[in-house]
């Protein structure tokens, strides 16, 4: 009587997360009567996967028709599979007896689970920079397996090099993470740029899976400030302009100083974006120069995005300005002429 | 459908032999272990033989050296030959199928009666 | 060989009653344990294998339990069709041994 032989044909069987797994095993004979068992690993600690004999497997069913006893086959599918359930997978003869006792076990099958990546979630510094200083994006996708994965960075569709990966863990797993961060240079112009992480993995068919970031979320691009003064008007009043020029975000609050003293504070709000992302806003003060002895100091300040307070100073020269008689003597005219001009240039 | 017809049951007397036959239809005989259970009147059941899908047999203590198991696979049937019988031989006696892989019974034929009287 | 011991061996009972059957094997028979149900001039009938797996065909008021020595068969709500005998049999060596038998009638 030849001896019994335990068939795992296949070695390896790889499998889609969400699809049914058949592992298939025969058994060259029936004799002696007893049970197959399925087991995923081996040793004491193995895991019991299906046994004909009793117990209630869900989503364990036997591929052939274990009534059928002369089909020797107790292939088995394993519905809904997830990275779970990799592992090795044994299909073991057992004598009956109490308790039954094993006789021969299959050479094993590997189950890996093809699993694909989450969507890839970029994140940013969690301060703003300016142009000419490097920032570093965050990208990170999990579950997927096998280990291996592409991970590329596109700044604006051009491809990054500056970038370190890691996949997790470094051993063998049921699935696996991968972190990569980056370091771009920004330039003023980057507003409207976007960061690209994209996940290429055998699961996705070649449809590789794409994370976002703009730019406008780690960059500040600081104010440039010009003050003017305008011809003088008729009613000896000046026009003095302060231009705040290519600034983001918009968060900005201007405060006017004449001769050192709080004219007036103005915050920006709604002002329409340039081309390039950025904003400008111009605010202008009449100054009627009748009403002063001395020239006036006036100093256009700019607080940008909670930094460091950016000042503009000009001065208006009095003595040039014939005095007119039972003038006001208010530094200001705080009538109607008192405004801002809100402007946008390109 | 599957299904066992024992056949060959009658009245002996003590010391005579009978053959019963049981006939399967609806499965492969050979494939499985088979199995002669008895029932005398009033009585519980009791196993009396067995033989294994090799063609190794098994008997009960009381039958052992009188009766003997066999089948015929181009017949696709199951036999008890019962030699030296005696009246505690007495009995309904039923071929049975032993199941899948761990020989439960599953499939019972309808019996078949042997008396045995002088 | 091994001695199987049914209790009770008579049992009366109303219809749309539960009723627990035990068995007790001498020594340990795994779960290797079978339950047959049995009417006046007829085969036996295969109920339950496996100490608790049904065979087909078997209505879900039957089940059974017990592993090592100790088994019971239950049935959850007497039906008339259901007065009948029932068998406890150990199958894990030879030679296969019954229990006496419990007799289940209508009170």
């Known amino acids: 009587e030849e001896e019994l032989q335990v068939i795992q044909p296949e070695k390896s069987v790889s499998v889609a997360a969400g699809d049914s797994a058949t592992l298939n095993c025969t058994v060259s004979s029936l004799i002696p009567v007893g049970p197959i068992q399925w087991f995923r690993g081996a040793g004491p600690g193995r895991e019991l996967i299906y046994n004909l004999k009793e117990g209630h497997f869900p989503r364990v069913t036997p591929v052939s028709d274990p009534t059928k006893r002369n089909n020797m086959d107790f292939s088995i599918r394993i519905s809904n599979i997830t990275p779970a359930d990799a592992g090795t997978y044994y299909c073991v003869k057992f004598r009956k007896g109490s308790p039954d006792v094993e006789l021969k076990s299959g050479a094993g099958t590997e189950l890996s689970v093809r699993a694909k990546p989450s969507a890839p979630v970029v994140s940013g510094p969690a301060v703003r920079a300016t142009a000419e200083h490097t920032v570093s994006f965050t990208c990170e996708s999990h579950g997927f397996s096998p280990r291996d994965i592409t991970l590329k960075w596109f700044k604006n569709g051009n491809e990054l090099s500056d970038f370190q990966t890691n996949v997790d863990p470094a051993g063998k797993s049921v699935s696996y993470s991968i972190r990569s961060t980056a370091r771009v240079v920004l330039t003023r112009r980057d507003v409207h740029s976007q960061v690209i992480c994209e996940v290429a993995h055998v699961t996705l068919q070649g449809d590789p899976l794409r994370g976002t970031a703009n730019l406008s979320e780690a960059i500040r691009v600081p104010p440039f400030l010009e003050v003017t003064q305008q011809s003088m008007r008729a009613d000896n009043q000046v026009n003095v302009t302060c231009q705040v020029t290519k600034f983001y975000p918009q968060r900005l609050q201007l405060t006017w100083l004449e001769n050192g003293n709080v004219s007036r504070t103005e915050m920006a709000s709604a002002l329409p974006e340039n081309k390039d992302g950025t904003y400008n806003w111009t605010s202008w003060l009449l100054v009627n120069v009748s009403a002063h002895r001395d020239d006036v100091k006036l100093t256009c300040q700019v607080e940008h995005d909670g930094q460091p307070a950016v000042n503009k100073s000009f001065s208006v020269k009095v003595s040039a300005h014939p005095k007119e008689q039972g003038s006001n003597t208010a530094a200001e005219n705080t009538g109607t002429n008192e405004r801002n001009i809100y402007g946008g240039s390109g | 459908e599957v299904q066992l017809v024992e056949s060959g049951g009658g009245l002996v007397q003590p010391g005579g032999s009978l053959r019963l036959s049981c006939a399967a239809s609806g499965f492969t005989l050979s494939s499985y272990d088979m199995h002669w259970v008895r029932q005398a009147t009033g009585k519980g059941l009791e196993w009396v033989s067995a033989?294994?899908?090799?063609?190794?047999?098994y008997y009960t203590g009381s039958v052992k050296g009188r009766f003997t198991i066999s089948r015929e696979n181009a017949k696709n049937s199951l036999y008890l030959q019962m030699n030296s019988l005696r009246a505690g031989d007495t009995a309904v006696y039923y071929c049975v199928r032993g199941g899948v892989w761990d020989d439960a019974f599953d499939i019972w034929g309808q019996g078949t009666m042997v008396t045995v009287s002088s | 060989d091994i001695q199987m011991t049914q209790s009770p061996s008579s049992l009366s009972a109303s219809v749309g009653d539960r009723v627990t059957i035990t068995c007790r094997a001498s020594q340990d028979i795994n779960n290797y344990l079978a339950w047959f149900q049995q009417k006046p001039g007829k085969a036996p009938k295969s109920l339950i294998y496996t100490a608790s797996s049904l065979h087909s065909g078997v209505p879900s008021k039957f089940s059974g339990s017990g592993s090592g020595t100790d088994f019971t068969l239950t049935i959850s709500s007497l039906q008339p069709e259901d007065f009948a005998t029932y068998y406890c049999q150990q199958y894990v060596s030879y030679p296969y041994t019954f229990g006496q038998g419990t007799k289940l009638e209508i009170k």
């Open positions: 033989i294994g899908t090799a063609g190794d047999t």
